[in-house]
């Protein structure tokens, strides 16, 4: 903590401006009133404070708002956001997407994945659900950030919003997140024709159960190997040789290339050798 000193009269601060960059840490601590800082947060980001000076300003705000900053302050944090820890952010209540956008822009190019994930989480909690506007904001300003949300938070996504999610937004999603998103996607795209449906559902298939994969094999989708490799192992294992053959179509030959990798390896080991032989690929169970 910065040690407390009295502010010299000539250093008294009546507004947040560029003069403050000449203040030493202890002068900032002594002379900047936290309430004034909070009221004029919109000026802070225009001033080229050092990281040490930002530490002092953060300390000021922490003292003023021990329960978490109000959104009026959060919105204007600017580069001060880089000083926030996930623990700090967890105390916030954020509802404005303008706030989210502003902070996502600041975080770009910095290693702040934990902070950003926590911020997004607070936005979802603050707004009550992961609505279309929030998803649009995330996909525009933070591709991949959707996958930083917990499965519990993702469960608040209404199926109607799924259409706004792009394949690249799901690249970093884990199995538990796709387990939550897949049924919503299936619902969202259920009225589409076979080929159009497959294009839309493909990025979500890492959450598909066996029955749905079997059903997909009836639609002549010719699933590519990259998609097949992302399927859940437990979902792939019960598929028969004929079903995998029908699911992959002409891409079935790719099984040979992937035969040592899961889920292909595990699936091969579960099949009768006679059945595997019918593929004519030399797969060994």
């Amino acid at each position: 903590d910065v040690e407390r000193t009295t502010c010299p009269p000539e250093k008294e601060v009546h507004e947040i401006d560029e003069n403050l960059i000449f203040y030493k840490k202890r002068e900032l601590e002594a002379c900047v009133d936290a309430a004034l800082l909070a009221a004029q947060m919109d000026r802070v980001d225009a001033i080229p404070f050092t990281y040490e000076q930002l530490d002092v300003l953060k300390h000021k705000l922490d003292e003023l708002y021990p329960q978490g900053y109000p959104e009026s302050v959060i919105r204007h944090l600017g580069h001060l956001f880089l000083k926030m820890s996930p623990e700090d952010i967890r105390k916030w209540n954020v509802t404005s997407l303008e706030t989210l956008k502003a902070l996502l822009k600041v975080s770009k190019g910095h290693e702040m994945s934990a902070q950003v994930a926590t911020l997004i989480d607070r936005v979802v909690v603050g707004r009550g659900q992961l609505d279309k506007d929030t998803v649009d904001t995330l996909t525009a300003f933070c591709p991949g950030c959707l996958c930083s949300l917990s499965p519990e938070r993702l469960s608040s996504v209404p199926p109607s919003v799924i259409g706004a999610v792009r394949p690249q937004d799901l690249d970093t999603c884990g199995p538990r997140q796709l387990d939550v998103l897949y049924p919503k996607a299936r619902l969202a795209f259920q009225n589409m024709s076979g080929s159009e449906y497959f294009v839309k559902i493909r990025p979500f298939l890492g959450g598909a159960p066996t029955e749905d994969l079997k059903a997909l094999s009836q639609q002549n989708v010719s699933m590519d190997l990259a998609t097949f490799m992302k399927l859940r192992r437990e979902a792939v294992l019960p598929l028969t040789v004929a079903e995998v053959q029908k699911l992959l179509g002409p891409h079935v030959e790719g099984l040979k290339v992937e035969e040592q990798h899961s889920p292909v390896r595990d699936w091969i080991l579960k099949q009768r050798q006679d059945d595997l032989d019918t593929l004519g690929l030399g797969l060994q169970g």
């Epitope: 079997k214 059903a215 004929a242 079903e243 995998v244 053959q245 179509g249």
Partner: antibody, heavy 117, light 107 residues
Framework: EVQLVESGGGLVQPGGSLRLSCAAS????????MSWVRQAPGKGLEWVAT????????YYPDSVKGRFTISRDNSKNTLYLQMNSLRAEDTAVYYC??????????WGQGTLVTVSS | DIQMTQSPSSLSASVGDRVTITCRAS??????LNWYQQKPGKAPKLLIY???RLHSGVPSRFSGSGSGTDFTLTISSLQPEDFATYYC?????????FGQGTKVEIK
């Protein structure tokens, strides 16, 4: 050994209903799609319905869509075909068949449905 | 719907003969073509799937070939138990459809 045994066939009047059953054994019933295929007297084979292994998905040709309903009870290893608004042209032997990807690989012995007044 | 047309509709042959049955699809079905054998009063039995793969227990005198729209079932040396009706079936696209059948009779 895969075994499929159909039952429930009989004589029914046009416009009437009938429910066919197929008892399956010798394989893990809940792992497979199942189908009904029919054969009118002296005629060829016609696919009638298919149901996914968990019962979520059903498929029908236009000739029976809206009139026939395929269902299953995996706890009883049994497949069903509910046939409503029956017509004379539905007269046929109805076969239950295991469906694997694109193949009807095992068939029951069939049950005869006669629609006549 | 994909139409499956078999030829001939029937044929007479003797034991030991080589028999060929053809099946034509109205559009490309890749190799998703299966053959079934049906004897009078009995259920159909799968013989060949995916154009040329023999189902378990099927004698090697049965073989299949083709791709796209034209397919062939061949019995290299007809045996007494082979007199039956044979059906082709496409498994490429719903609704799955069968040929009208080819009856192989004793000459």
């Amino acid at each position: 050994e895969v075994q499929l045994v159909e039952s429930g066939g009989g004589l029914v009047q046009p416009g009437g209903s009938l429910r066919l059953s197929c008892a399956a054994s010798g394989f893990t019933f809940s792992d497979y799609f199942m189908s009904w295929v029919r054969q009118a007297p002296g005629k060829g084979l016609e696919w009638v319905a298919t149901i996914s292994n968990g019962g979520t998905y059903t498929y029908y040709p236009d000739s029976v869509k809206g009139r026939f309903t395929i269902s299953r009870d995996n706890s009883k290893n049994t497949l069903y075909l509910q046939m409503n608004s029956l017509r004379a042209e539905d007269t046929a032997v109805y076969y239950c068949a295991r469906f694997d990807g694109y193949i009807f690989d095992y068939w029951g012995q069939g049950t005869l449905v006669t629609v006549s007044s | 719907d994909i139409q499956m047309t078999q030829s001939p509709s029937s044929l007479s042959a003797s034991v030991g003969d080589r028999v060929t049955i053809t099946c034509r699809a109205s559009q490309d079905i890749s190799n998703y073509l299966n053959w079934y054998q049906q004897k009078p009063g009995k259920a159909p039995k799968l013989l060949i799937y995916y154009t040329s793969r023999l189902h378990s227990g099927v004698p090697s005198r049965f073989s299949g070939s083709g791709s796209g729209t034209d397919f062939t079932l061949t019995i290299s040396s007809l045996q007494p138990e082979d007199f039956a009706t044979y059906y082709c079936q496409q498994g490429n696209t719903l609704p799955y459809t069968f040929g009208q059948g080819t009856k192989v009779e004793i000459k």
